[in-house]
């Protein structure tokens, strides 16, 4: 199964991925690629990790912003674009045969509700509303054009707005 | 120029051992995953094994984890493939590939392959 | 495991033809789907990778298109070197398998 995490164009993403390294400090070489993980290594690499360095960042939107010597591995991509949407891979590449530990997850980048911050909104959509599905893999980010994004049903929508209400949000409808 | 040499093919009796290595030059050896695949003769291709870049991740095809062990040896540029009770249906030419890479790419498909060395398992 | 299926297994064509060889995976790798050609007793040569995506050096006249389970290699007008063995392969699920192989005769 997948979680599939919900952000709002021009918000930050973050899309968690941890492992605890064994013994402490002994780090692995992780890497975050746009499209399901595929046989080996991430596909599409956004990022890696090395020993204690980032490498292979291939825009300025991408983060570790998390204290990844210590397994926070998570990724955090700044002001999304509907082009963000798709399923990313964190490969935590643990030494050994086969041993690699796999997590695709499912960003979904909606266009902005019609909703005006209250000044203490301050979080991502994404770390509010991540969603368990029970659907299989899905493929390449390359291969799903905004076009054929998943609709956001109603019920999301409801949380969405009272959740922004609740936190003192003026809603234009 | 790439260039991937294979060696350590041969004539060897079922149950017997022999280590295949592959000398690369033209290249940062140790930036690239390396991968071993056979072809038997008159067939298709067949993956074996994948080693990552630092060594420190293997992959095999299940059928052989048990009795092949890949390899490589960053400071000499060299792959290995260590075979191990061999049977008669290993026998084929043995290719050493590199893994496709580029800045933001995976290595999952093999832009470079030496010219094979053939084993032969035969009693 | 899985399976790639190519066809046809031989195919018989004269310089200038346009060719298509099909590839089909029992499931769906999406665009995990990589073209090599191999002449007789040569090693493989990448063709193209991510189903679509021309290796540099690789002539136009070659092309890769499908995703999901079915996928196409097409030659726009065979030359006298195209005359090989090609394979699919995909790097979607483990083990990476390749098709069985499409031989291109000289009609």
């Known amino acids: 199964s997948e979680v599939e995490y919900i952000a709002e164009v021009g918000q930050n993403a973050y899309l968690p991925c941890s492992y605890t390294p064994a013994p402490p400090g002994n780090l692995v070489p992780v890497c975050w690629g746009k499209g399901a993980c595929p046989v080996f290594d991430c596909s599409n690499v956004v990022l890696r990790t090395e020993n204690r360095d980032v490498n292979d960042r291939t825009s300025g939107r991408y983060w570790l912003k998390g204290d990844f010597h210590k397994g926070d591995v998570s990724l955090t991509i700044e002001n999304v674009t509907l082009a963000d949407s798709g399923v990313y891979c964190c490969r935590i590449q643990i030494p050994g045969i086969m041993n690699d530990e796999k997590h695709n997850l499912k960003l979904v980048v909606i266009k902005p509700a019609k909703v005006t911050p209250a000044p203490t909104l301050q979080r991502d959509l994404t770390s509010a509303f991540p969603r368990m599905l029970t659907t299989g893999e899905h493929g390449p980010a390359e291969t799903q054009t905004p076009g054929s994004l998943p609709d956001v049903n109603l019920t999301q929508i409801f949380t969405l707005t009272n959740e922004l209400r609740d936190s003192g949000a003026t809603i234009r409808t | 120029e790439v260039q991937l040499v294979e060696s350590g093919g041969g004539l060897v009796k079922p149950g017997g051992s022999l280590r295949l290595s592959c000398a690369a030059s033209?290249?940062?050896?140790?930036?690239?995953?390396m991968t071993w695949v056979r072809q038997a003769p008159g067939k298709g291709l067949e993956w074996v094994s994948s080693?990552?870049?630092?060594?420190?991740?293997?992959y095999y095809l299940d059928s052989l984890k048990s009795r092949f062990t890949i390899s490589r040896d960053n400071a000499k540029n060299s792959l290995y493939l260590q075979m191990n009770s061999l049977r008669a249906e290993d026998t084929a030419v043995y290719y050493c590939?590199?893994?496709?890479?580029?800045?933001?790419?995976?290595?999952?498909?093999?832009?470079?392959w030496g010219q094979g060395t053939l084993v032969t398992v035969s009693s | 495991d899985i399976q790639m299926t190519q066809s046809p297994s031989s195919l018989s064509a004269s310089v200038g033809d346009r060719v298509t060889i099909t590839c089909r995976a029992s499931e769906n790798i999406y665009s995990y789907l990589t073209w090599y050609q191999q002449k007789p007793g040569k090693a493989p040569k990448l063709l193209i990778y991510?189903?679509?995506t021309l290796a540099e050096g690789v002539p136009s006249r070659f092309s890769g298109s499908g995703s999901g389970t079915d996928f196409t290699l097409t030659i726009s007008s065979l030359q006298p070197e195209d005359f090989a063995t090609y394979y699919c392969?995909?790097?979607?699920?483990?083990?990476?398998?390749f098709g069985q192989g499409t031989k291109l005769e000289i009609k």
């Open positions: 991510n189903a679509k």
């Open positions: 080693i990552n870049y630092d060594g420190r991740n293997t």
């Open positions: 392969q995909q790097h979607y699920g483990t083990p990476l398998t």
């Open positions: 590939a590199r893994g496709y890479y580029y800045y933001g790419s995976s290595p999952n498909y093999f832009d470079y």
């Open positions: 033209g290249f940062t050896f140790s930036d690239y995953y």
